[in-house]
Amino acid sequence: KESCDVQLYIKRQSEHSILAGDPFELECPVKYCANRPHVTWCKLNGTTCVKLEDRQTSWKEEKNISFFILHFEPVLPNDNGSYRCSANFQSNLIESHSTTLYVTDVKSASERPSKDEMASRPWLLYR
């Protein structure tokens, strides 16, 4: 008889580069046998992972795998950071590898001083 654990398929050092202001879906691939497990997302903050309980999430079911999705509508600059998904089943908790979002703030990127400005006013680098 084959073992039937809930499984989370986020690879080591998974990362996404995204733009602030855009919508984004962060997927946690989940495999389960019978009953769909309770899955949550959390964001790493120091030594703890803070549950994201008030955020919009949804499930996407495919033939051999399901995805528990954390929605960013839109992405904000402070969404930058590392996230984990975790699943509860049979009183066990399993936590995925962390997945990191690198958020580029388009607004601040477009407002960066030019090379000429930085050459004449190097203190702008330290703002």
Epitope: K1, E2, S3, D5, V6, Q7, L8, Y9, I10, K11, R12, Q13, K31, L44, T47, N64, S82, I94, E95, S96, H97, S98
Partner: antibody, heavy 118, light 106 residues
């Protein structure tokens, strides 16, 4: 129950290749990744790489170009081939199953001794 | 790659006494650390994952702790069957193991 049973000991000449098999039972290779770890005599453990559920691979850069990991889901068997063997490759080679979250190795094969000697 | 430096290389402890093994990562690995026990002639066995979670069937005298770069495996009261080599392993990036600690009875 979960088991990983590896092929028998091998003796190879320098420059040759070796292919070690790992037959699993109690779980499916379409559901779990499998790692390969080696241990030289009296030494520590060295991760060689792994094969994911979809057949994609992730190799330790120290073995890149010399190691190939494959699997046959229908035979529930994973293979690790190491080429251009040298005496430093003499070691016990283990296959090990990834935990359901991929963050540790929970079941290990019994090991396969590979001796490289001229 | 991330280097895991384990100390001490060997340790002799009296039966019933506490044994402490340390592991230091060359960079932060969050809590992505596992500990394994290997007895002579056997394959490694998983003891601890997520740095502090005891694996199924592992006696509660084994405790893992730490976060970031510094990790510890503690055996609160050494038993004869605990004589083995212990390895830490990081799984934050491409997995690497510590060099091992040989635990013996004093």
């Amino acid at each position: 129950q979960v088991q990983l049973v590896q092929s028998g000991a091998e003796v190879k000449k320098p420059g040759a290749s070796v292919k070690v098999s790992c037959k699993v039972s109690g779980f499916s290779l379409t559901g779990y990744g499998v790692n390969w770890v080696r241990q030289a005599p009296g030494q520590g453990l060295e991760w060689m790489g792994m094969i994911w559920i979809d057949g994609s691979t992730d190799y330790n850069s120290a073995f890149q170009g010399r190691v190939t990991m494959t699997k046959d889901n229908s035979k529930s068997t994973v293979y690790m081939e190491l080429s251009s063997l040298r005496s430093e490759d003499t070691a016990v080679y283990y296959c090990a199953r990834d935990r359901p979250d991929g963050r540790a190795m929970d079941y290990w094969g019994q090991g396969t001794m590979v001796t490289v000697s001229s | 790659s991330i280097v895991m430096t384990q100390s001490p290389d060997s340790l002799a402890v009296s039966l019933g006494e506490r044994a402490t093994i340390n592991c230091k990562a060359s960079q932060s690995v969050s809590n992505d650390v596992a500990w394994y026990q290997q007895k002579p002639g056997q394959s490694p066995k998983l003891l601890i994952y997520y740095a502090s979670n005891r694996y199924t069937g592992v006696p509660d005298r084994f405790t893992g702790s730490g976060y970031g770069t510094d990790f510890t495996l503690t055996i609160s009261s050494l038993q004869a069957e605990d004589v083995a080599v212990y390895f830490c392993q990081q799984d934050y990036s491409s997995p690497t193991f510590g060099g091992g600690t040989k635990l013996e009875i004093k």
